[in-house]
């Protein structure tokens, strides 16, 4: 790391170490040998998140509701607004600009993980033992039907799509 | 009281490595910078550099970059300056001192030493 | 860098004498200058600091002057605990930089 001129929370400005302005305020004026750097809060609209030297700050960020958003976290002088999507949506990139549909998993498919307002729907394949029959966005793969608990026999096998279908045993008079 | 007690004098061979640790008390160790300075025999005095023992932050001299590392241990409230590959022009008494408190200063860097410690000699011969 | 010249590089006066020493910086540093006090053996002493700010503890017999690039020291009566050699530190900037000190030796 290069040498710097002045100590942490400083900047170099006509030969002269100056303090930053605090998270939350802007720079209005460098300092001199007499003064203090000079710093005013950021409006009820704008923020700056780091120690800085900017004369303008950040607008917050605007949770557009046509794209699907809405405010997760209101913002404050010292941090942006956090959007998030509406119910069944999800943020299509990490800085959720705008919001898609959940996926749903197809027959075949249970949910694995349910989506989030940031991640979408995870699915995973139905193991041996497990079906699922709907497209949905919540359902887990579910076991097949034991047709022995219930006094009954399998007369037609399972497969990840359909339950197992159960009917009465054979039962041979002697 | 503020006292900075330093590690014993070294000897060491060239292109060796040498570790001074500079032990605080009496204040609050993450408060203050500390600063490394060298006085070689019969010279004048060498800034080398300082820690910020709160954040880790370090800034050192051109001359020493690459060679030198300052660290601390806040649990026990030391500092320790290391320079590798040493040399015969490195023979000096190194000093730990201490800075202005955080925040004392606004503009400047105003870094003024008002507790320093006793010196560590450090001999590099072969 | 900046550089810290300090004149003269030694003196010889006598206990009672005014004592004066500049400090001369390669440019401006405003009035981030510290003087320290060395005596032989040991780590040095600060004196005084943003050029006229005098130390807690340190004699009143101790003065410093000067702005910009231009800095003096002065003992305006030297006493024997004060021979020594004195050191300016500019504070304006990193790195830090020391002049090459003044020698008060007895006349």
């Known amino acids: 790391e290069p040498p710097t001129a002045c100590r942490e929370k400083q900047y170099l400005i006509n030969s002269q170490c100056c303090s930053l302005c605090q998270p939350g305020q802007k720079l209005v004026s460098d300092c001199t040998e007499f003064t203090e750097t000079e710093c005013l809060p950021c409006s009820e609209s704008e923020f700056l998140d780091t120690w800085n030297r900017e004369t303008r700050c950040h607008q917050h960020k605007y949770c557009d509701p046509n794209l699907g958003l809405r405010v997760q976290q209101k913002g404050t002088s010292e941090t942006d607004t956090i959007c998030t999507c509406e119910e069944g949506l999800h943020c299509m990139s990490e800085s959720c600009e705008s919001c898609v549909p959940h996926r749903s998993c197809l027959p075949g498919f249970g949910v694995k993980q349910i989506a989030t307002g940031v991640s979408d729907t995870i699915c995973e394949p139905c193991p041996v033992g497990f079906f699922s029959n709907v497209s949905s966005a919540f359902e887990k793969c579910r076991p097949w039907t034991s047709c022995e608990t219930k006094d009954l026999v399998v007369q037609q096998a399972g497969t990840n799509k359909t339950d197992v279908v159960c009917g009465p045993q054979d039962r041979q008079r002697a | 009281q503020v006292q900075l007690v330093q590690s014993g004098a070294e000897v060491k061979k060239p292109g060796a490595s040498v570790k001074v640790s500079c032990k605080a008390s009496g204040y609050t160790f993450t408060g203050y910078y500390m600063h490394w300075v060298r006085q070689a025999p019969g010279q004048g005095l060498e800034w080398m550099g300082w820690i910020n023992p709160d954040s880790g932050g370090t800034n050192y001299a051109q001359k020493f970059q690459g060679r030198v590392t300052m660290t601390r241990d806040t649990s026990i409230s030391t500092a320790y300056m290391e320079l590798n590959r040493l040399r015969s022009d490195d023979t000096a008494v190194y000093y730990c001192?201490?800075?202005?408190?955080?925040?004392?200063?606004?503009?400047?860097?105003?870094?003024?030493?008002?507790?320093w410690g006793q010196g560590t000699l450090v001999t590099v011969s072969s | 860098d900046i550089q810290m010249t300090q004149s003269p590089s030694s003196v010889s006066a006598s206990v009672g004498d005014r004592v004066t020493i500049t400090c001369r910086a390669s440019?401006?540093?405003?009035?981030?200058l510290a003087w320290y006090q060395q005596k032989p053996g040991k780590a040095p002493n600060l004196l005084i600091y943003?050029?006229?700010t005098l130390q807690s503890g340190v004699p009143s017999r101790f003065s410093g002057s000067g702005s910009g690039t231009d800095f003096t020291l002065t003992i305006s009566s030297l006493q024997p605990e004060d021979f020594a050699t004195y050191y300016c530190?500019?504070?304006?900037?990193?790195?830090?930089?020391f002049g090459g000190g003044t020698k008060v030796e007895i006349k």
């Open positions: 440019q401006g540093i405003y009035s981030w």
């Open positions: 943003t050029a006229s």
């Open positions: 001192a201490r800075d202005q408190p955080l925040g004392y200063c606004t503009n400047g860097v105003c870094s003024y030493f008002d507790y």
């Open positions: 530190q500019q504070a304006n900037i990193f790195p830090l930089t």
